[in-house]
Amino acid sequence: RKIPKVGHTFFQKPESCPPVPGGSMKLDIGIINENQRVSMSRNIESRSTSPWNYTVTWDPNRYPSEVVQAQCRNLGCINAQGKEDISMNSVPIQQETLVVRRKHQGCSVSFQLEKVLVTVGCTCVTPVIHHVQ
Amino acid sequence: GITIPRNPGCPNSEDKNFPRTVMVNLNIHNRNTNTNPKRSSDYYNRSTSPWNLHRNEDPERYPSVIWEAKCRHLGCINADGNVDYHMNSVPIQQEILVLRREPPHCPNSFRLEKILVSVGCTCVTPIVHHVA
């Protein structure tokens, strides 16, 4: 998947663009909005009818090196009595994000953009049964 | 990717931190993931805390299209298909990294940007604050 070029109908490439070798792009990894914080309701992972746990994955050759993944605790959903109800299903909600991967080749290093699918949390759904004979 | 020679004395002198600016290949790994949540699953309709998906488009950003979830109800859908206000539908938010064209309009120069997206909704027991 290549990054699309700027559409000519929208705007022309300015003269101020930095020179970039063919087949590559310049990427500044000083993050815009670095200090922005998620303002989700408190403890929703425990209060949800489809609760989840978090696992931190760490990779020194990835930027950011820390990626948090959620895992649904149950197959079913938690009912009003606090019991797992298997007539409903807990399912993961996923979102893509970008990371920069550092690759070592001998004494050289290269950088590659990578799409990572992050499981963000879980939701409770009515199951679908496909009748396949 | 684009190869950058390491410092003399490699591998011991390798910098553990990422440099501020890197040259990266235009090809993105794991391109086979589906970017349209409506096509990848119908959880948004089948959930007890259903949500609508809104398209957010910005040509100065990669990916240029991001889908934002908005919970349909304040409450959750019960077994009878009615909205139960004893429970709450709340958005699940996630910080993601995108590419922002910098300087603006440049085709091959970007900066990482952190944005907050609502990915879907989940049904939670509300927190009731007892005020004396």
Partner: nanobody
Framework: EVQLVESGGGLVQAGGSLRLSCGAS????????TGWFRQAPGKEREFVAV????????AYADSVEGRFTISRDGAKNTVYLQMSSLKPEDTAIYYC???????????WGQGTQVTVSS
């Protein structure tokens, strides 16, 4: 294509036991989850037991909790439902189902009839 074949049903007296088996032919079970549901004439379909493959998490319907046990034998590519202290209300056709992804279930075969007499 994977076909699920249920067996082990039959007629049993109240208080008795049965062990249902579900075999996967033409492939292996889905990597996500496997479960059993039942359908009695004129009644709604009811999931009775489910098992998640990644961590062997199991869960049961309230109506069978403590009496039924779902288990698997990976080597034999078989999932079992051990049913004990059976009641007349457990009478139904029992189907084995496999989850290809969370929230979605597929089943094959005709199921197996369980009849509990009083």
């Amino acid at each position: 294509e994977v076909q699920l074949v249920e067996s082990g049903g039959g007629l049993v007296q109240a208080g008795g036991s049965l062990r249902l088996s579900c075999g996967a032919s033409g492939g292996t079970f889905s990597s996500y989850a496997t479960g059993w549901f039942r359908q009695a004439p004129g009644k709604e379909r009811e999931f009775v037991a489910v098992l998640r493959w990644s961590d062997s998490h199991t869960a049961y319907a309230d109506s069978v909790e403590g009496r039924f046990t779902i288990s698997r034998d990976g080597a034999k590519n078989t999932v079992y439902l051990q049913m004990s202290s059976l009641k007349p209300e457990d009478t139904a056709i029992y189907y084995c189902t496999t989850g290809t992804r969370p929230g979605e279930w597929h089943y094959w075969g005709q199921g197996t009839q369980v009849t509990v007499s009083s």
